[in-house]
């Protein structure tokens, strides 16, 4: 089941997920000046079985200037600078697809996307947040949102995180400032109260990446 | 919950233009497709276009391209679709739905086209 | 673009009994990206299906879809008094998105 809505918004922060559960849609949409070759997918579909999962259909950009021609353009390095998400993309996979069942990785980028990644979760998907740069976390709880499916809606969890600006003084006691920046691996990534099996995979997972999977742009 | 509200019916002269608005409240507005779809009286639904807000890049039908203008604010979370050039064949009802797979839809816009 | 045809164009069935409506797409669409909707009269489209068998929220479990590649089936088990209405099949897996031509469910 789709999840409604997108999770919830925190200011000064970005949202990633560490995988994919199968049933998650990415929109395939590119950047000014380029469209989807014609009859084209829509939609990636994360899709498998108990032992593989993987990404169905292929995004697919080509010139708008050029008609039936599927020739594509390879991105200057200043134009690849420019694609940011809302969400945190990483362009290497921290994770070993088999080892989350049922569970895609982050698809690797095509050639003239778009700014922006749309996803479509579904039920059971687990985000993690972060302060975005220039910014840091006041944890109150879990830094993270699960869909859940509840009274016949979808819903999402609301992740306890709060991020103020470097100037700012305020904060929790004992809390230090951080070292890298964007910000490391939220501390609360260990401390999931979910307790379906799927979220104690993925955060058990995510107690192990590395702080390097935040990076908020491809390189 | 999802609500997209739709501005009210028009009568328009032919070879004017009619702009439609679609307001959402209560979700994810900029970072999912706003389709316009039209019907036409006791005919099947017709899809125009869509758009993405927070991309601003709008898709359009090849029957309406050059005609069609579909845009957004994300300040105000509405969207817009104007058409051109109308003719009678333009009377219809026009629906803005969220999704490509119209998971809301606002309540329609009757555009009467007659001289 | 994929087309698609939806038949019959009218159903005349009894309430409580079983509705079965076919769309088929002149080509392949990809992943079961298919949505089935009803409409009645001065209303807009209600999504029912989506990805060719999930239920949308709230519909109840006596409209179910099934069907891949290019033949679809929305089936409506018992039909209810407010079930009667004109169903349509839409395909969402490449541009331009389609319509079939729809299906009128009406009371025999």
């Known amino acids: 089941e789709l999840c409604d809505d997108d999770p919830p918004e925190i200011p000064h922060a970005t949202f990633k997920a560490m995988a994919y559960k199968e049933g998650t849609m990415l929109n395939c949409e590119c950047k000014r000046g380029f469209r989807r070759i014609k009859s084209g997918s829509l939609y990636m579909l994360c899709t498998g079985n108990s032992s593989h999962s993987s990404w169905d259909n292929q995004c697919q950009c080509t010139s708008s200037a050029t008609r039936n021609t599927t020739k594509q353009v390879t991105p200057q390095p200043e134009e690849q600078k420019e694609r940011k998400t809302t969400e945190m993309q990483s362009p290497m996979q921290p994770v070993d697809q088999a080892s989350l069942p049922g569970h895609c990785r982050e698809p690797p980028p095509w050639e003239n996307e778009a700014t922006e990644r749309i996803y479509h979760f579904v039920v059971g998907q687990m985000v993690y947040y972060q302060c975005v740069q220039g910014y840091r976390a006041l944890h109150r709880g879990p830094a993270e949102s699960v869909c859940k499916m509840t009274h016949g809606k979808t819903r999402w969890t609301q992740p306890q995180l709060i991020c103020t600006g470097e100037m700012e003084t305020s904060q929790f006691p004992g809390e230090e400032k951080p070292q890298a920046s964007p910000e490391g691996r939220p501390e609360s990534e260990t401390s999931c109260l979910v307790t379906t099996t799927d979220f104690q995979i993925q955060t058990e997972m995510a107690a192990t990446m590395e702080t390097s999977i935040f990076t908020t742009e491809y390189q | 919950q999802v609500q997209l509200v739709q501005s009210g019916a028009e009568v328009k002269k032919p070879g004017s233009s009619v702009k439609v608005s679609c307001k959402a409240s209560?979700?994810?507005?900029?970072?999912?497709?706003i389709n316009w779809v039209r019907q036409a009286p006791g005919q099947g639904l017709e899809w125009m276009g869509r758009?993405?807000?927070?991309?601003?890049?709008?898709d359009y039908a090849q029957r309406f391209q050059g005609r069609v203008t579909i845009t957004a604010d994300k300040s105000t979370n509405t969207a817009y679709m104007e058409l051109s050039s109308l003719r009678s064949e333009d009377t219809a009802v026009y629906y803005c739905?969220?999704?490509?797979?119209?998971?809301?839809w606002g309540q329609g816009t009757l555009v009467t086209v007659s001289s | 673009e994929i087309v698609l045809t939806q038949s019959p164009g009218t159903l005349s069935l009894s309430p409580g009994e079983r509705a079965t409506l076919s769309c088929r797409a002149s080509?392949?669409?990809?992943?079961?990206?298919l949505a089935w909707y009803q409409q009645k009269p001065g209303q807009a489209p209600r999504l029912l299906i989506y990805?060719?068998?999930s239920r949308a929220t709230g519909i109840p479990d006596r409209f179910s879809g099934s069907g891949s590649g290019t033949d679809f089936t929305l089936t409506i088990s018992r039909l209810e008094p407010e079930d009667f209405a004109v169903y349509y099949c839409?395909?969402?897996?490449?541009?331009?998105?389609?319509f079939g031509g729809g299906t009128k469910v009406e009371i025999k």
């Open positions: 739905a969220r999704r490509d797979w119209g998971d809301y």
């Open positions: 209560g979700g994810t507005f900029s970072r999912y497709p």
């Open positions: 758009i993405i807000p927070i991309l601003g890049i709008a």
């Open positions: 080509q392949s669409v990809s992943s079961s990206f």
């Open positions: 990805g060719a068998s």
């Open positions: 839409q395909q969402y897996s490449s541009s331009p998105l389609t």
